[in-house]
């Protein structure tokens, strides 16, 4: 009975999410393998988040709006491990917008989800950020490593969206 009611609940939750995401990829987790964590297909998952690499070239504002429509934000990178996971799926000759910007040009960088900007957990390329005119951050491959660079916000780039996993 307990298992049956849990399955019914899951099915109704899945139906609820189906109107937003036509397909979900779910894995069982938790100590009793009773919880399912899901990401929209074909998003990738890492820890408690789902990631989507958009190859559509758009400005920073349009990229953030695009993520928002999908229930996500431009990516907020919190750890080196997270960045290493993300960069596995990126092309080394491309640049991708992050959810990091400095809208007033005061070098007060801010994440789209209001996560505090911690200077100790940043991965700027050497010498970056280097221009108050360049108010949006990308991640790109330079000098044999992935790192961040400040760029003009209106220049179209690819982007990375991030959302919390869906638990059912």
């Amino acid at each position: 009975n307990f298992m049956y009611s849990k399955t019914v609940k899951r099915l109704s939750k899945l139906q609820e999410y189906q109107q937003y995401y036509p397909s979900l990829t779910c894995v069982m987790e938790g100590k009793d393998m009773e919880d399912w964590s899901c990401c929209p297909t074909p998003w990738t998952s890492f820890q408690s988040s789902c990631y989507f690499i958009s190859t559509v070239m758009q400005s920073w504002t349009k990229s953030q709006n695009n993520c928002s429509v999908m229930g996500a934000d431009l990516v907020v990178i919190n750890t080196k491990e997270e960045q290493d996971f993300i960069t596995q799926n990126l092309k080394i000759n491309s640049a991708y917008f992050l959810g990091l910007s400095d809208p007033k040009g005061w070098r007060h960088w801010q994440w789209v989800d209001q996560t505090p900007y911690n200077k100790n957990v940043t991965f700027w390329h050497s010498g970056e950020p280097n221009s108050p005119d360049e108010r949006c951050a990308i991640i790109n491959f330079r000098s044999e490593e992935w790192g961040w660079n400040d760029v003009h916000c209106h220049v179209p780039q690819k982007s990375i969206c991030k959302m919390k996993k869906i638990y059912i």
């Epitope: 758009q58 400005s59 920073w60 504002t61 349009k62 953030q64 709006n65 910007s101 809208p103 007033k104 040009g105 280097n130 221009s131 108050p132 005119d133 360049e134 108010r135 949006c136 760029v151 003009h152 916000c153 209106h154 220049v155 179209p156």
Partner: antibody, heavy 121, light 111 residues
Framework: EVQLLESGGGLVQPGGSLRLSCAAS????????MSWVRQAPGKGLEWVAT????????YYPDSVKGRFTISRDNSKNTLYLQMNSLRAEDTAVYYC??????????????WGQGTTVTVSS | DIVLTQSPDSLAVSLGERATINCKAS??????????VNWYQQKPGQPPKLLIY???NLESGIPDRFSGSGSGTDFTLTISSLQAEDVAVYYC?????????FGGGTKVEIK
């Protein structure tokens, strides 16, 4: 007073090359992103190129990409536009302008008087 | 590319009367409460001059008879009381996304 003085325009044959210069004074040139905008005779305005203050990032519309190169020499307070493989439709007055950011966008706040480029055989 | 369509193409207004110019974008140029549309004035034989930025902010040194309004895709430049020195072509421009694009221009003349 901000002054932007373009030079280098002239008559050139299709397929030819030309280098425009823009000498800036009255601003700390090395801190400014700069742009070129053109205006064909009797027509509207068209953005041509932008370069950031350090000169390491450049941007172009598809209409000139691969043919035009924007560059700068901050020690000389000068902006350049190298134009190759010129076409009749590149005939225009070319203006240099300073770029001022506005949140996630920008404005072109100071403009030079322009230099005329004519591409004709 | 974002297309900006200005209307009318030309406008004849009596001295002291109001002039209104419209600019329609092919997609929204707003983000987080700001609109990325600017207005420029170009007099014959002169370079363009910035009047309004961010849809409604008056550039320093521009007379306050000029004003801008609008958001999303629809924007307006208003000259509240036309003066002889306002005879010019007016252009809207978007800076939300490259390539920056300009409207086709509106020629303002005195009736």
């Amino acid at each position: 007073e901000v002054q932007l003085l373009e030079s280098g325009g002239g008559l050139v044959q299709p397929g030819g090359s030309l280098r425009l210069s823009c000498a800036a004074s009255g601003i700390t040139f090395s801190t400014y992103t700069m742009s070129w905008v053109r205006q064909a005779p009797g027509k509207g305005l068209e953005w041509v190129a932008t370069i950031n203050s350090g000169g390491d990032n450049t941007y172009y519309p598809d209409s000139v990409k691969g043919r035009f190169t924007i560059s700068r020499d901050n020690s000389k307070n000068t902006l350049y536009l190298q134009m190759n493989s010129l076409r009749a439709e590149d005939t225009a007055v070319y203006y240099c302008a300073t770029y001022r950011p506005y949140y996630y966008g920008s404005v072109l706040d100071y403009w030079g008087q322009g230099t005329t480029v004519t591409v004709s055989s | 590319d974002i297309v900006l369509t200005q209307s009318p193409d030309s406008l004849a207004v009596s001295l002291g009367e109001r002039a209104t110019i419209n600019c329609k974008a092919s997609q929204s140029v707003d983000y987080d409460g700001n609109s990325y549309v600017n207005w420029y004035q170009q007099k014959p034989g002169q370079p363009p001059k910035l009047l309004i930025y961010g849809a409604s902010n008056l550039e320093s040194g521009i007379p306050d008879r000029f004003s801008g309004s609008g958001s999303g895709t629809d924007f307006t430049l208003t000259i509240s009381s036309l003066q002889a020195e306002d005879v010019a072509v007016y252009y809207c421009q978007q800076s939300d996304e490259d390539p920056w694009t300009f409207g086709g221009g509106t020629k303002v003349e005195i009736k």
